[in-house]
């Protein structure tokens, strides 16, 4: 499988303002779509606060694989990267810079919303092509990790939600795409 990376074109965009690739055109079945359905877009912070944050959305464009099959076209996906503030920068005991806040809640840049995109997979040896829907990150956000509680407890960053919430990676490869995610594993 020497197909994993197509190109790695990481660009930094502001969450909520970035451009995402359009999914392929669908059958014209809009009469069933609920007018007010779906989830509202989440803007982790206002534009005026941007300088205080460094939650980044990195765009990676590459082919996807599922076993021996490869996507007919490359797919652009987001990876959430960077630290979140606002905070003071302080060196720690071994000289690395880290975010610090009084009483120590940490902030992490993790996926916020997801989208699905149809992907056509071409298989070698004359095997039939496959059609899959790949789940991709649509946007990133800052979530708060409270040190005084379970380390896995993530909270939405912002006053609108105080609920503990699990964060997770964007479905990092339950099937053949696992190898595709390897180079992204440490991004967030």
């Amino acid at each position: 499988q020497g197909w994993q990376a197509f190109r790695n074109d990481a660009t930094e965009v502001i969450p909520g303002l970035g451009e995402y690739p359009e999914p392929p055109p669908e059958n014209n079945q809009t009469m069933n779509r609920a007018e007010n359905g779906g989830r509202p877009p989440h803007h982790p912070y206002d534009a005026k606060d941007v300088s205080e944050y460094s939650c980044r959305e990195l765009h990676y464009t590459r082919f996807l694989t599922d076993g021996p099959c490869r996507s007919a076209k490359p797919v652009t996906e987001l990876v959430c990267s960077g630290q979140c503030g606002p905070a003071r920068l302080l060196p720690n005991a071994i000289g690395r810079v880290k975010w610090w806040r009084p009483n120590g809640p940490d902030f992490r840049c993790i996926p916020d919303r997801y989208r699905a995109q149809r992907v056509q997979l071409l298989c070698p040896g004359g095997a039939a092509p496959r059609s899959r829907k790949v789940r991709l990150v649509a946007s990133c956000k800052c979530k708060r990790l409270t040190r005084f509680h379970n380390q896995s407890e993530l909270k939405d960053f912002g006053p609108e939600t105080a609920r503990p919430q699990k964060g997770r990676k964007p479905r990092p490869g339950a099937r053949g795409a696992k190898a595709n995610q390897a180079e992204l594993e440490n991004a967030y």
């Epitope: 079945q29 989830r39 092509p129 059609s131 919430q165 479905r171």
Partner: antibody
């Protein structure tokens, strides 16, 4: 592991509304695509509607347009399906179903235990 | 709205092979309908056997396989077991709108 627990059985009169809940545990509801399926006694499965992550919105089956509303309370990780103007033929077991972990999107992987709604005068 | 058709009932002998099919009123079923197959036993919720035409799940016995055959989605059971007696439903994706087939009652005897 995603688990879905639905509200208990309901008995309703014709013309009334019913609201069935589906509590998600083991995952965050906002990260899942929830669908609703019903099954009348002795009959087959019927898709009612659900969240479409491609379009980022909820899609309802044409048959239920204007009568069904699917909502989510992300603060409690609970999804709701409300069906109005009930008639006797709406007597059925109502299931919630959601997608699963994995890079590839797979719908209808986890199912609630079902909620029996009986419409009777 | 599309209509999805299945055989109402099929019978297979223990150890035998049977193929259930799933057709669409709109034409040939293709990989872009992402065919799903579900198994349902009396008094239980359905469970997914196959997604996206041929993709099995961790709980799907190896004797089940999915494919496309002659413009239909197909579920093949090779080496039927008594516990495979159940109702089987297919589901097709019409661009975000889903339609179930009427179900096939599979008897193993």
């Amino acid at each position: 592991e995603v688990q879905l627990v639905q509200s208990g059985a309901e008995v309703k009169k014709p013309g009334a509304s019913v609201k069935v809940s589906c509590k998600v545990s083991g995952y965050t509801l906002s990260e899942l695509s929830m669908h609703w399926v019903r099954q009348a006694p002795g009959k087959g499965l019927e898709w009612m509607g659900g969240f479409d992550p491609e379009g980022g919105e909820t899609i309802y089956a044409q048959k239920f347009q204007g009568r069904v509303t699917m909502t989510e309370d992300t603060s409690t990780d609970t999804a709701y399906m409300e069906l109005s103007s009930l008639r006797s033929e709406d007597t059925a077991v109502y299931y919630c179903a959601t997608d699963t972990e994995g890079y590839w999107e797979k719908f209808f992987q986890h199912w609630g235990q079902g909620t029996l709604v009986t419409v009777s005068s | 709205q599309a209509v999805v058709t299945q055989e109402p009932s099929l019978t297979v002998s223990p150890g035998g092979t049977v193929t259930l099919t799933c057709g669409s009123s709109t034409g040939a079923v293709t990989i872009d309908h992402y065919p799903y197959w579900f198994q349902q036993k009396p008094g239980q919720a359905p469970r997914t056997l196959i997604s996206d035409t041929d993709d099995k799940h961790s709980w799907t016995p190896a004797r089940f396989s999915g494919s496309l055959l002659g413009g239909k989605a197909a579920l093949t059971l090779s080496g039927a077991q008594p516990e495979d007696e159940a109702e089987y439903y297919c589901l097709l994706d019409y661009g975000g709108t889903f339609v179930f087939g009427g179900g096939t009652k599979l008897t193993v005897l």
